[in-house]
């Protein structure tokens, strides 16, 4: 039995997301469950550090992109939202909050000028911005 939620404010087109817990979850109340991940899109603008703290306070982390297949709903996300990817200048790499290095062929990095934190943009793009700039953000919990 599938129900669907239509998140027109978040997505570029009508997206059907299965909500039945027997297929996915459990997730915090009102979060989106999709292919064994829980997601929540937060409308309030915070800098990267505040966004990270907000996710952590809900036992989650900022969005981590690990699979285009398992996270294909992200392809249609509108606008720009903080995710958990940061530039580590000392070793010249892009790293997730958990310390893992960004794998190739997941994101197209778009660097403007000075900035060490990544915004998620549609179709798996990582748009680099100053970490102190306020933006909306995406929190994520792995269910498996």
């Amino acid at each position: 039995i599938w129900s669907a939620v239509f998140l027109n404010s978040l997505f570029n087109q009508e997206v059907q997301i299965p909500l039945t817990e027997s297929y996915c979850g459990p997730c915090p109340k009102n979060w989106i469950c999709y292919k064994n991940n829980c997601y929540q899109f937060f409308d309030e603008s915070k800098n990267w550090y505040e966004s990270q703290a907000s996710c952590m306070s809900q036992n989650a982390s900022l969005l981590k992109v690990y699979s285009k297949e398992d996270q294909d709903l992200l392809k249609l996300v509108k606008s720009y939202h903080w995710m958990g990817l940061v530039h580590i200048p000392t070793n010249g790499s892009w790293q997730w909050e958990d310390g893992s290095i960004l794998s190739p062929n997941l994101l197209t990095i778009i660097e403007m000028q000075k900035g060490d934190c990544a915004l998620y943009a549609s179709s798996f793009k990582g748009y680099i911005e100053n970490c102190s700039t306020p933006n909306t953000y995406i929190c994520m919990q792995r269910t498996v």
């Epitope: 010249g92 790499s93 892009w94 290095i101 960004l102 190739p104 062929n105 994101l107 197209t108 990095i109 778009i110 660097e111 403007m112 000028q113 943009a121 549609s122 179709s123 793009k125």
Partner: antibody
């Protein structure tokens, strides 16, 4: 083989607009970014902007914002650049090129069109 | 913007000699173990042609006389030996940051 075809020349009047085309063939159009580059006579190369045909995501050189507008028609594998409010400063050769994604960045341009010479003259 | 400074602006070489062209970036263009600098050759009346990508990778079909080296901010294109067909303007391009920027070009002539 991979090709980007551009018209040879466009003659336009000052203040007018022109829409340049770049028709791709020999590869899957939506898997590579399209770049646009300007070269004034006897001068160097200047990057205008880029577009991802898969989702029409664009990045512009700040200098060309308001001057250039990038679009694509995926059904005909054609990229377009519209230049508006033309002046003599816009007289140049305009190239399109294919941007290659290396796993992290669109790091280089491997195939270039032959260029369209735009002449702005009354 | 990342500024790429090429030197020399022009170069007159004897056939068979080694030509070296420098490209210096105003900030690092290296990331994730990759050097995002590329070299192009432009002959009169033609579009630029990719010679070297990621600082040292030879594009398919380009003669092995061309080679590239360098990392972070300092890069070099080497042509050894120089041939008559190499008369052209050579440009470096950085692919790390928006706006993408080119060096000012180096004109190679034969003595």
């Amino acid at each position: 083989q991979v090709q980007l075809q551009q018209p040879g020349a466009e003659l336009v009047k000052p203040g007018a607009s022109v829409k340049l085309s770049c028709k791709a063939s020999g590869y899957t159009f939506t898997t590579y970014w399209i770049q646009w580059i300007k070269q004034r006579p006897g001068q160097g190369l200047e990057w205008i902007g880029e577009i991802d045909p898969s989702d029409i995501f664009t990045n512009y050189n700040q200098k060309f914002k308001g001057k250039a507008t990038l679009t694509v028609d995926t059904s005909s594998s054609t990229a377009y650049m519209q230049l508006s409010s033309l002046t003599s400063e816009d007289s140049a050769v305009y190239y399109c090129a294919r941007g290659v994604y290396d796993g992290y960045y669109v790091g280089y341009f491997d195939v270039w069109g032959t260029g369209t010479t735009v002449t702005v003259s009354s | 913007d990342i500024v790429l400074t090429q030197s020399p602006a022009s170069l007159a070489m004897s056939l068979g000699k080694r030509a070296t062209i420098s490209c210096r970036a105003s900030e690092s263009v290296s990331i994730m173990g990759t050097n995002l600098i590329n070299w192009y050759q432009q002959k009169l009346g033609q579009p630029p042609k990719l010679l070297i990508y990621h600082a040292s990778n030879l594009e398919t079909g380009v003669p092995a006389r061309f080679s590239g080296s360098g990392s972070r901010t300092d890069f070099t294109l080497t042509i050894d030996p120089v041939e008559e067909d190499d008369v052209a303007v050579y440009y470096c391009l950085q692919g790390r940051k928006i706006p993408r920027t080119f060096g000012g070009g180096t004109k190679l002539e034969i003595k």
